[in-house]
Interface confidence: low
């Protein structure tokens, strides 16, 4: 049984243009992070690995920073940028964890009334 | 060959502090978590304290029963990793080992004895 | 906290004989279970990890197997260094915790 759980920002908004932090935790497990990938449905943003560090997919190098910590910096947002962001933590022994956030990006004067996009 | 040297260890008095160390040779120290585990006769072997890796941002986790008392550290550019340990009580009495661990790798120093008494 | 309640508490045993040691999870551990040897120097070297993977550099002789909530580590014949005490480690949630250990005496 896999005891870990992952916490995640949940479902977030940010400006166009802007910037935005997708964060991941993993807890209540003593399994160890071997490497953490972050993806946008089916496209390959990042990868942190334990051993070899930071990789930035080429085609997101202008706008991914990676961090703070096992997180990523998305910046230079744009409308399409809007959907689904998984981080999949591989631990040993457990096994693969995988957190979901929902990112809106909003046009400016939309995200000033502080409209926010939820999921029920 | 892997090595976890260990500080001296030593008598303090109820309520003091003592500080105990580890330096690690022959592996990537920055890779390993790192725990404090101590053994005594009346508990056994009783998981105490561990520190994550660097980007991990160095999350610690503590047993309950050193909780705001215990405090782990590490420097890695000294491949050390440290137990600070505050109002000791006589239950804290016991042989202290530091023991590292990374994917399948395994590794304990020698025990360092602690004994809280008046 | 995962009480693990290790049996028997001592064993007396001879050369080249073949001793099982287990421990029982209180609760669910999947198998995230290691066991240790603790030499009488105090020495501690883990030599299963997984509940039956043998670490590198570990004797054959040494086994480990689990039966539902039961893990068992068995020396199939018995050297003079494997007189020690033995502990099973959950790791499978926090805090870790260990078996209350088995000395095993030579006979």
């Known amino acids: 049984m896999m005891t870990g759980t992952i916490e995640t920002t949940g479902n977030i908004s940010a400006e166009k243009g802007g910037s935005i932090i997708l964060q991941c935790h993993l807890s209540s497990t003593t399994a160890q992070v071997t490497q953490v990938n972050w993806e946008q449905q089916d496209q390959l943003l990042a990868i942190c690995n334990a051993d070899l560090g930071w990789h930035i997919s080429p085609s997101f190098k202008d706008r991914v920073a990676p961090g703070p910590g096992l997180g990523l910096t998305l910046q230079s947002l744009t409308v399409n940028d809007t959907g689904e962001y998984f981080c999949i933590y591989h631990t040993y022994p457990d096994g693969t964890y995988t957190g979901r956030i929902f990112l809106e990006v909003l046009e400016s004067s939309v995200a000033e009334h502080g409209a926010r996009f939820q999921i029920p | 060959e892997v090595k976890l040297e260990k500080s001296r260890g030593g008598l303090v008095q109820p309520g003091g502090s003592m500080k105990i160390s580890c330096v690690a040779s022959?592996?990537?120290?920055?890779?390993?978590?790192m725990n404090w585990v101590r053994h005594s006769p009346e508990k056994g072997l009783e998981w105490v304290a561990q520190?994550?890796?660097?980007?991990?941002?160095?999350?610690?986790h503590y047993a309950e029963s050193v909780k705001g008392r215990f405090t782990i550290s590490r420097d890695d550019s000294k491949r050390s990793v440290y137990l600070q340990m505050n109002s000791l009580g006589a239950e804290d009495t016991g042989i202290y080992y530091c023991h590292g661990n990374f994917y399948t790798l395994d590794y304990w120093g020698q025990g360092i004895s602690v004994t809280v008494s008046s | 906290d995962i009480q693990m309640t290790q049996s028997p508490s001592s064993l007396s045993a001879s050369l080249g004989e073949g001793v099982t040691l287990t421990c029982r999870a209180g609760?669910?551990?999947?198998?995230?279970l290691s066991w240790l040897q603790q030499k009488p120097d105090g020495t501690i070297k883990r030599l299963i990890y997984a509940a039956s993977t043998l670490d590198s550099g570990v004797p054959k002789r040494f086994s480990g197997r689990r039966s539902g909530s039961d893990y068992s580590l068995t020396i199939s014949s018995l050297e003079s260094e494997d007189f020690a005490d033995y502990y099973c480690?959950?790791?499978?949630?926090?805090?870790?915790?260990f078996g209350g250990g088995t000395k095993l005496e030579i006979k």
């Open positions: 520190i994550r890796l660097n980007s991990d941002n160095y999350a610690t």
């Open positions: 480690l959950q790791y499978a949630s926090y805090p870790p915790t």
């Open positions: 022959g592996f990537t120290f920055s890779n390993f978590w």
């Open positions: 609760q669910e551990i999947t198998g995230f």
